[in-house]
């Protein structure tokens, strides 16, 4: 039993980080093989994460993690029963892909803008919080060529836009997606997308 | 919010033992390590030693080896040091504070006189 | 003995920029991330910045830090009468035992 491709990680500088990697083979991830991590800290005691299979020859592994902060440095083990198959170090802060943003919400009820509004995915207290930037995907069900993206470059988890910039009468999605440029992460996951029925009033002509 | 509420001033006599309580409130217990440091009248911040809620294991400054002793209860989120051979120079406000590399957030400190 | 230098004292006018020193070597700062500590009077320490240069959220950015080597700087500007206070460094030393030093303690005065 070997690696094929050796174990990548990213983490959510939160309390998860995900590691995937590629057997030789065909595997029972869950049942052939273990994934030991520790922080390198004074203290820190060593955590078993348990895979489960990411198709034939792919294995995945959550690994719990508290208080995730710039300084931290953990080691990884694989193991296969008694043999270590690889072994390496993982630093979150240079690994970050942040959570997805939630509650995505369309306020239609504002006289003629379309207001969309989100929650941040961080509590307070963690450094991302005040640090991530958005991009909002809108597209029309009806025309795939009716795409665009809306960049949002200021803290707070909202766009506004003039209802009149969509066509009227048809049925839009929106989602959006997070990054912090303060620790160059990769963007997160899309949201969930939400729908809405673009109607607005076309402006008298004389 | 979090919340380290530690217990009240002590004065004890040079050869005794102290024990100090600090209880912690608004997070996680068990997730963040917690650091014990004192400051002497007028004086600056000395670390004591840092110890793991989760598993109980503590390490302690060279200063203090042999003479502190930091432990905790996951049941009432608590944590305590005691300090033994107390001297004069023992007298200072002892601080609690959560964090890993660097020290979150401050209990208000529990002032030990040692005098005879 | 703190193994972390700071000056005894600075001060400033309201408004003022004002910059506080940290020296130490390179077990601890060359090695590390630095944090400051504000300590009020009769007050708990609290934590000022933390990774070099990181404000916990509800720190004004008058506050700001760097590191360089086995030095760093605490730099306060817009000056307030509230500022006045003992500033703390801190850091941690692998070098023999996992140590957490402290700066000496630089008082800030508001003239």
């Known amino acids: 039993m070997k690696v094929l491709q050796e174990p990548t990680c990213v983490s959510d500088y939160m309390s998860i980080s995900t590691c995937e990697w590629k057997m030789n083979g065909p595997t029972n991830c869950s049942t052939e093989l273990r994934l030991l991590y520790q922080l390198v800290f004074l203290l820190s005691e060593a955590h078993t994460c348990i895979p489960e299979n990411n198709g034939g020859a792919g294995c995945v592994c959550h690994l719990l993690m508290d208080d995730v902060v710039s300084a931290d440095n953990y080691t990884l083990d694989l193991w296969a029963g008694q043999q270590l198959l690889w072994k390496g170090s993982f630093k979150p802060s240079e690994h970050v892909k942040p959570r997805a943003p939630g509650n995505l919400t369309v306020h239609t009820n504002v006289s003629d803008t379309l207001l969309l509004t989100w929650s941040n995915p961080y509590p307070p207290d963690n450094y991302l919080y005040n640090h991530l930037t958005y991009a909002v995907n809108i597209w029309s069900e009806n025309d795939p060529a009716d795409f665009r993206i809306y960049n949002v470059t200021y803290l707070e988890p909202s766009l506004r836009i003039a209802a009149s910039t969509l066509k009227s009468g048809i049925s839009y999605r929106a989602r959006v997606r997070a990054w912090a440029q303060c620790y160059n992460t990769t963007w997160s996951e899309w949201s969930p997308s939400t729908k809405w029925h673009n109607s607005y009033r076309e402006p008298f002509e004389q | 919010q979090v919340q380290l509420v530690q217990s009240g001033a002590e004065v004890k006599k040079p050869g005794a033992s102290v024990k100090v309580s600090c209880k912690a409130s608004g997070y996680a217990f068990t997730s963040y390590y917690m650091h014990w440091a004192r400051q002497a009248p007028g004086q600056g911040l000395e670390w004591m030693g840092i110890?793991?809620?989760?598993?109980?294991?503590?390490s302690y400054a060279q200063k203090f080896q042999g003479r502190v002793t930091m432990t905790r209860d996951t049941s009432t989120s608590t944590v305590y040091m005691e300090l033994s051979s107390l001297r004069s120079e023992d007298t200072a406000v002892y601080y609690c504070?959560?964090?890993?590399?660097?020290?979150?957030?401050w209990g208000k400190g529990t002032l030990v006189t040692v005098s005879s | 003995q703190s193994v972390l230098t700071q000056p005894p004292s600075v001060s400033a006018a309201p408004g003022q920029k004002v910059t506080i020193s940290c020296s130490g070597g390179s077990s601890n700062i060359g090695n590390s991330y630095v944090s400051w500590y504000q300590q009020l009077p009769g007050t708990a320490p609290k934590l000022l910045i933390y990774?070099?240069?990181k404000r916990p959220s509800g720190i004004p950015d008058r506050f700001s830090g760097s590191k360089s080597g086995t030095s760093a700087t605490l730099a306060i500007t817009g000056l307030q009468t509230g500022d006045e206070a003992v500033y703390f460094c801190?850091?941690?030393?692998?070098?023999?035992?996992?140590?957490?030093?402290f700066g000496t303690g630089t008082k800030l005065t508001v003239l």
């Open positions: 504070a959560r964090g890993k590399y660097w020290m979150y957030d």
């Open positions: 990774d070099n240069n």
């Open positions: 110890i793991n809620p989760s598993g109980g294991s503590a």
């Open positions: 801190g850091t941690w030393d692998t070098s023999t035992v996992w140590e957490w030093p």
